[in-house]
């Protein structure tokens, strides 16, 4: 659809005569009839297949034609067409004399014709005017013409209909050739697909308007490139949705079981060395001078009774010092200046001479010890506490403080590791010499049956079109992560490509 426009510029008829040569009375009141038709090698009479138009009287004899496009569109003359412009045409322009006011063909005598010109040729659609001048014996006509497309029609022959729009069926303007030019932020054949936020993950994100990034199930973050870990995951991460891969030192289904109590809690005091020995379990190796489960107790070096022969022990900053009784000397009062004649043996001990009387030895009755039978027997010296238990003197008796995992008077009994019900998900616990073993029910595995291997919802390969399947462990269901171009809960639907333009 378009318009053939003809702009009449000047008509010269100096002698004011008709085509017959007869003069007009009083002058030639001139109007024009225009016939536009298909291309003819020799322009001949016949139907004006592309249209006709007539002007009112524009002047007398010779005159210039005013541009009157604003005042009703009389000049340029408009010859609209509702077909594809063929690129060629024939044009007939007749100048007529109007003796009266009736300009209808049937109201005019045939000899009222002043001049007739006929041209034909090629004409491309465009904004530029073609200027032409046709001269006959008595008249001259100067005019210009062009073909332009009607509103919303585009292309070389005005055949492409395109209407700019900015709604959900398209966001575009029209290019000169009729193709669409998408508005900023939109793409697709009809410019109806928004361009998501730059960097928005192609598979895991989408958008409904430009510069947006909405996440598909299992993904989060500004660009939908961060997976959502399994619900309840405490000290773990994921590389695909609903995973819970434990950080170092953590275990269990939700990574909430502390396997590195030493690092996370630093329980050992006074520079002791900490060793992890199981979930929330540890052992402290104390530095000299310290004791207790967490090495929190400072040991007196005199507690080991290092002074012999009744010497008294004094604690010092850098150790201890023995004050020896008369007749003894040495670091631990171990050297004697006494003999049996001095009755050195206490508590009923009997004395025996040694080295020709230069030395002696005391034989102590039960419950006494020491080189002079001066000490009551320390019931802990025989290390009666098994399995690393700590022996404590309590007057005439003794008791053992046991390490975790042991019990009994002498810590000789191994506490059942199974007592804490360590096996998850109904696993059966077996005590072993060095720990325990869990026998897991169907669907669970791991040292403590903490790994769910039950219904792998992805085992049946429910996702189509090479989608990635993730098992949601909390619900035993699956989530399909679709590749680009597919949607649906199983990625079973291709995102349809719209058909081509219906030109």
């Amino acid at each position: 659809s378009g318009v053939f426009q003809l702009q009449l510029q000047e008509f010269i008829n100096e002698r004011g005569v008709l085509a017959s040569g007869r003069p007009c009375e009083p002058g030639c009141r001139t109007f024009f009839r225009v016939c536009l038709k298909h291309f003819q090698a020799v322009v001949s009479p016949g139907p004006c297949t592309f249209g006709t138009v007539s002007t009112p009287v524009l002047g007398t004899n010779s005159f210039a034609v005013r541009d009157d496009s604003s005042g009703g569109g009389r000049n340029p003359l408009q010859l609209p067409f509702n077909f594809t412009w063929p690129g060629t045409f024939s044009l007939i322009i007749e100048a007529w004399h109007a003796p009266g006011d009736d300009l209808r063909p049937e109201a005019l005598p045939p000899d009222a014709l002043i001049s007739k010109i006929a041209i034909q040729g090629s004409l491309a659609v465009g904004q530029n005017w073609l200027l032409d001048e046709q001269t006959s014996t008595l008249t001259r006509l100067r005019y210009s013409y062009r073909v332009i497309c009607s509103d919303n029609y585009y292309g070389d022959n005005c055949s492409r209909l395109c209407k700019k729009r900015n709604d959900h069926f398209g966001h575009y303007v029209c290019q000169p050739d009729g193709n669409l030019s998408c508005l900023p932020g939109w793409t697709g054949e009809y410019c109806q697909q928004p361009i998501c936020l730059s960097g928005c993950h192609e598979q895991n994100g989408y958008c409904s308007k430009p510069a947006e990034c909405l996440c598909r199930p299992g993904w989060q973050g500004r660009l939908c490139n961060e997976c959502i870990p399994h619900n309840g995951c405490r000290h773990g991460t994921c590389s695909t949705p609903w995973q819970c891969t434990c950080d170092e030192g953590w275990g269990g289904l939700f990574c909430d079981q502390d396997l590195n109590y030493c690092t996370h809690h630093s329980p050992c005091k006074n520079g002791a060395t900490c060793s992890n020995s199981g979930q929330r379990s540890y052992t402290c190796t104390c530095r000299p001078g310290y004791t207790g489960v967490d090495c929190e107790l400072e040991l007196s070096e005199c507690d080991s009774n290092p002074c012999r022969n009744g010497g008294s022990c004094k604690d010092q900053e850098d150790g201890y010092h023995c004050l020896c009784p008369p007749g003894y000397y040495g670091l631990h009062c171990e050297h004697s200046t006494l003999s049996c004649a001095d009755s050195p043996c206490f508590n009923g001990g009997s004395c025996r001479e040694r080295n020709q009387g230069a030395n002696y030895a005391c034989e102590c009755p039960p419950n006494f010890t020491g080189s002079n039978c001066e000490k009551k027997v320390d019931r802990c010296t025989s290390n009666p506490c098994a399995n690393g238990g700590q022996c404590l003197n309590r007057g005439p008796s003794r008791m053992c403080r046991c390490r975790p995992g042991f019990t009994g008077t002498y810590c000789e009994l191994h506490v059942s590791d199974c007592a804490r019900n360590p096996c998850a998900h109904g696993g059966t616990c077996h005590d072993l010499e060095n720990g325990l073993m869990c026998t897991c029910p169907a669907g669970f595995s791991g040292r403590r049956c903490e790994v769910r291997t039950s219904i792998d919802a992805c085992a049946s390969s429910p996702c189509f079109n090479r989608a990635t399947c993730y098992t949601d462990l909390s619900t035993d269901t699956f989530v399909c992560n679709c590749p680009y171009g597919f949607v649906g809960s199983r990625c079973e639907f291709p995102v349809g490509l719209p058909p081509s333009f219906p030109w």
Partner: antibody
Framework: EVQLQESGPGLVKPSETLSLTCTVS??????????WGWIRQPPGKGLEWIGD???????YYNPSLKNRVTISVDTSKNQFSLKLSSVTAADTAVYYC?????????????WGQGTLVTVSS | SYELTQPPSVSVSPGQTASITCSGD??????VSWYQQKPGQSPVLVIY???NRPSGIPERFSGSNSGDTATLTISGTQAMDEADYYC?????????FGSGTKVT
Amino acid sequence: EVQLQESGPGLVKPSETLSLTCTVSGGSISSSSYYWGWIRQPPGKGLEWIGDINYAGSTYYNPSLKNRVTISVDTSKNQFSLKLSSVTAADTAVYYCAREAVALGGGADSWGQGTLVTVSS
Amino acid sequence: SYELTQPPSVSVSPGQTASITCSGDMLGDKYVSWYQQKPGQSPVLVIYEDTNRPSGIPERFSGSNSGDTATLTISGTQAMDEADYYCQAWDSETGVFGSGTKVT
């Protein structure tokens, strides 16, 4: 060939919510080439566009109904739904679901057979 | 709100041409669709984007749109063409239907 089928109660009490579902068969609702719309026609009167939605859930509503209407999509079931709240007798109409094609400038090339919803106590 | 106006009825003799108009402000700058609806049936798209016919629609149906008026023309009208006809356009994000024309 794509087919659309409306379903839902034929009688709704005044002030309640009208709920209809359109099931799409013979084609995927998850195509960027189409919007899925609801149109109604009161007895003996003309057509009125209610609103539409695409597979991603972008919705557009008739301003005259916007405060009362909600359209949603379920791509896994290949369905889309209409909810119209606070209904009155004026909402009595045949309700159609239709497919609006982007390539046809928004023309609705497939329609359901329509379901009559009467609002009455 | 945007409105599309249609004549309530148009009468035509079989074999003659029926023209149904649809007018709206600057309608020529919008794409117009036309729907045919027979009694008790769902509407059927007969023209889209002003002038295009969907497959299966007879050639006797044609459309045009310029200025403020779109026209649906049925040339060589047949008895089976008796129906209600609705024009439809999009104003911003809203679908707008004409009031409908009964062709007898």
